[in-house]
């Protein structure tokens, strides 16, 4: 039960995280104009990974896409790449984790396969979260560097008469969304990896042999009701109809009323 809960929660947390990473990547407010001592501005600038926007106090908003690849800063390209890699890995991870969920039965998929898929999706979520956090952090670092550079050159005098106000940019909402989303995806991934440990079949030191009781087709398995480790066990009660003795390793897993912690 705890395994199912951990796995399910990891999936949901990762799902929210990846949705957040997608939202952050699409958002226009990665950097917003620093208003410093002027909270009311006639022209407000903000920029995303894909376009820059201007909102006038009249309410008119105009956004322009970056219709160039070569002309963009390498750092921006790197951030775009990290976010896209994060989304792709996260999406694949979600797809894999759906099939790995213990509560979902697909044919006769073994728990060991589910465990492997859970681990795979968990690792994908961790990498996805790290990509998002790295991407957002690189952009934030870029902003901080530019902020202090533009503060140093806040007013460039032209003959001592004309002043050119340099627009400074600070952290936009997308950065915080990205950090939180990346963190959630990372946590979800860790939870999936923890759940994987509980899903993996435990190795026993003996081969459990099924014996026939005369006149009954009910198998008796020594250690059939082992004390639970908290992560579930692969030993199940099972009726044997072919009259042959099997080792526990060969016995396929089916749901039973004892399948809980």
């Amino acid at each position: 039960m705890a395994v199912t809960a951990c796995q399910g929660l990891g999936f949901v947390v990762s799902l929210i995280g990846i949705a957040g990473i997608i939202a952050a990547t699409c958002m226009d407010q990665w950097s917003t104009q620093d208003l410093y001592n002027n909270p009311v501005t006639a022209v407000f600038n903000y920029q995303g990974l894909w376009r820059s926007c201007v909102r006038e106090s009249s309410g008119f908003t105009e956004c322009r896409g970056y219709f160039t690849l070569l002309g963009l800063p390498a750092m921006l390209q790197a951030v775009r790449a990290l976010m896209i890699v994060g989304i792709v890995l996260g999406a694949i991870g979600l797809l894999v984790s759906i099939f790995a969920l213990k509560c979902i039965r697909i044919g006769s998929m073994e728990d060991s396969a589910k465990a492997n898929m859970t681990l795979t999706s968990g690792i994908m979520f961790i990498v996805s979260g790290l990509c998002a956090i790295a991407g957002v952090s690189v952009f934030a670092n870029m902003l901080v560097t530019n902020f202090w550079m533009s503060t140093a050159n806040m007013y460039t005098g032209m003959g001592g008469m004309v002043q050119t106000v340099q627009t400074r940019y600070t952290f936009g909402a997308a950065l915080f969304v990205g950090w939180v989303a990346g963190g959630l995806t990372l946590i979800g991934g860790v939870m999936m990896c923890i759940a994987c440990r509980g899903l993996a079949p435990e190795e026993t030191n003996y081969k459990a042999v099924s014996y026939h009781a005369s006149g009954h087709s009910v198998a008796y398995k020594p250690g059939g009701f082992k004390a639970s480790t908290g992560f579930g066990s692969n030993t199940k009660n099972k009726k044997i109809y072919d009259g042959g003795a099997r080792t526990e390793d060969e016995v396929q897993s089916y749901p039973s009323k004892h399948d809980y912690v």
Epitope: A42, V43, Q163, V165
Partner: antibody, heavy 118, light 113 residues
């Protein structure tokens, strides 16, 4: 047709207060900032401040803080400007104007002439 | 606050002539975000409120005759009337639409001979 109808001319004594009105029609009142501009006789234009009819938020020219108070009545699509402690220098024509694209004023009221005289 | 200096303060021309008037700003009115200059031109005829002519330094307001042209960038702006008509008798004001408080130039009075 967009119209900004301002109240009639006012004659007040120095030190008194006055409330000017600007009734908007022909557009969605709550969608545009309403600005107020002062023009003294034979002189240029001075921006007083602005109010947003939807949120009620205001922004004033530092020079007019404490002098002008902008309010509105959404139900009647009317913006108001109260001017207090009036000296004779406040004698001027006061305009209300609607802000549009480019942060420009596309529609203006006809102006209210305020005369401060004893 | 941004200071706008208009010149000349007045000019007298004959109908059909080309007229240019200048507006200089103490700060750049060019917004880097959209590469637009936030300068507006108004025409005020005697006894009337100002009328919007040009915004974004060069965009003509609808209904404004095409003889009115705005140009310039950064700190130096010009309003040109290609062929002055008798009805163009007015005072022309430029306005900073970039930062609060909005400020206006002192105006250029256009008179017709």
């Amino acid at each position: 047709e967009v119209q900004l109808q301002e109240s009639g001319a006012e004659l007040v004594k120095p030190g008194a207060s006055v409330k000017l009105s600007c009734k908007a029609s022909g557009y969605i009142f709550t969608s545009y900032w309403m600005h107020w501009v002062k023009q003294r006789p034979g002189q240029g234009l001075e921006w007083i401040g602005m109010i947003h009819p939807n949120s009620g938020s205001t922004n004033y020219n530092e020079k007019f803080k404490g002098k002008a108070t902008l309010t509105l009545d959404k139900s009647s699509s009317t913006a108001y400007m109260q001017l207090s402690s009036l000296p004779s220098e406040d004698s001027a024509v006061y305009y209300c104007a609607r802000l549009k694209t480019g942060n420009s004023f596309d529609y203006w009221g006809q102006g209210t002439t305020l005369t401060v005289s004893s | 606050d941004i200071v706008l200096t208009q010149s000349p303060s007045s000019l007298t021309v004959t109908a059909g002539e080309k007229v240019t008037m200048s507006c200089k700003s103490s700060q750049s009115l060019l917004n880097s975000g959209n590469q637009k200059n936030y300068l507006t031109w108004y025409q005020q005829k005697p006894g009337q409120p100002p009328k919007l002519l040009i915004y974004w330094a060069s965009t003509r307001e609808s209904g404004v005759p095409d003889r009115f042209t705005g140009s310039g960038s950064g700190t130096d702006f010009t309003l040109t009337i290609s062929s002055v008509q008798a009805e163009d008798l007015a005072i022309y004001y430029c306005q900073n639409a970039y930062t609060y408080p909005f400020t206006f130039g002192s105006g250029t009075k256009l008179e017709i001979k």
